[in-house]
């Protein structure tokens, strides 16, 4: 007799997500010498450990300590370049640029990037029918608990003059609603981080408007200045040459605004 | 700009103990919780400690629970990690980071542990 199930409305686990999470971890640390002391078998061990057997709606920051403590690593607290809904000219960036930092460049990013998880109270199985929806369903939820915790460590992290990728061709260019609004923006430490720098990126060829001027833009500059960190803004007109221009900063054509 | 200086290390024998210390400035030392990680030769970065800016909570290692103290002074913007029954394995540079990790950028130059019979 099949057991009663929760059902929930998101998405269930990522098909053969503990071989996927230890792959990753393997390959990370193949990648990255100074991370190959890393046990990746604990790593897993404790990522398991923060939401197995754990009711999927109650998962708590305090559940994923022991895999922060697995994760620690160096971060040039400099070279942090936040994002947000433009995930993927990001990570091209941080490819070319290879000092610079998101957050799926770190271990703990880089094992969770795209993937979805949950478990079930009492039991040690993993859900692979749903999962919680954040809205639907619940915000303490096992993936989203994650991201909020990694990412308000990596927000604390950072010093100096910090940048973020923000998506110049949706409605809302800085949205209060996502990670990058509510969470990292309000854990830069003011005592470390000078200035943050927005970088927004257009999307159409033709597009030659001052998007810095969007009144989210305004907003976000607003919450930042009464945090008493420095705010600046740079219209990436065109990111397919910007992308170019950091691959070979000599080209004659990269000194014209792009 | 953040700063720090450790200090305090040295060649001591298993089972023996050290003190070492962190003196920090640049910032407001105690809204800060600050973390004590190491680094053995040919190893990667590894926390040992967190305390709060407060003092209040504390959080260690495995491998150090119940031989090393980590414990702070705001007043003299200083944070300090008692190491007791020292061991082999404990040979590190040790360093002291602002934050709770697991992103550490260490300012300091550390200081060298070796435990060595």
């Known amino acids: 007799v099949p057991r009663w199930r929760q059902q929930w409305s998101g998405p269930g686990t990522t098909k053969r997500f503990p071989e996927t999470v230890l792959a990753r971890c393997v390959k990370y640390t193949e990648i990255h010498p100074e991370m190959r002391h890393v046990d990746c078998q604990s790593v897993w061990d404790a990522f398991k450990g923060a939401f197995i057997s754990k009711h999927p709606c109650n998962i708590t920051e305090e559940d994923y300590q022991p895999l922060m403590k697995l994760g620690t690593q160096t971060v040039p607290c400099n070279k942090i370049l936040l994002w947000s809904r433009i995930k993927d000219l990001a990570h091209q960036f941080t490819q070319v640029q290879r000092d610079m930092f998101t957050l799926e460049d770190t271990l703990l990013g880089y094992l969770a990037d795209d993937l979805t998880w949950c478990g079930e109270f009492n039991t040690s199985k993993i859900n692979y029918q749903s999962c919680p929806d954040w809205r639907k369903d619940c915000s303490n939820n096992p993936v989203s608990v994650f991201w909020k915790t990694v990412s308000r460590r990596f927000a604390e992290a950072a010093c100096d003059v910090v940048h973020v990728m923000l998506n110049g061709s949706r409605s809302k260019i800085f949205d209060k609603n996502s990670t990058f609004g509510s969470v990292e923006v309000h854990n830069l430490q003011p005592e470390k981080v000078q200035t943050l720098e927005a970088w927004v990126i257009h999307g159409g060829r033709e597009d030659s408007r001052d998007l810095c001027q969007d009144p989210t833009i305004k907003e976000l500059e607003s919450i930042i200045s009464k945090r008493n960190i420095q705010f600046s803004c740079k219209n990436i007109y065109r990111p397919d040459k910007f992308l170019q221009c950091v691959k070979n900063p000599e080209d004659s054509s990269c000194t014209s605004e792009i | 700009e953040v700063q720090v200086l450790e200090s305090g290390g040295g060649l001591v024998q298993p089972g023996g103990s050290l003190r070492l210390s962190c003196a920090a400035s640049g910032f407001t030392f105690s809204n800060f919780a600050m973390s004590w990680v190491r680094q053995a030769p040919g190893k990667g970065l590894e926390w040992v400690s967190t305390i709060s800016g407060s003092a209040g909570t504390t959080d260690y290692a495995d491998s150090v629970k119940g031989r090393f103290t980590i414990s702070r002074d705001n007043s003299k913007k200083t944070l300090y990690l008692q190491m007791n029954s020292l061991r082999v394995e404990d040979t590190a540079v040790y360093y002291c980071?602002?934050?709770?990790?697991?992103?550490?950028?260490?300012r300091g130059q550390g200081t060298l542990v070796t435990v060595s019979s």
């Open positions: 980071a602002d934050g709770r990790g697991p992103f550490f950028d260490y």
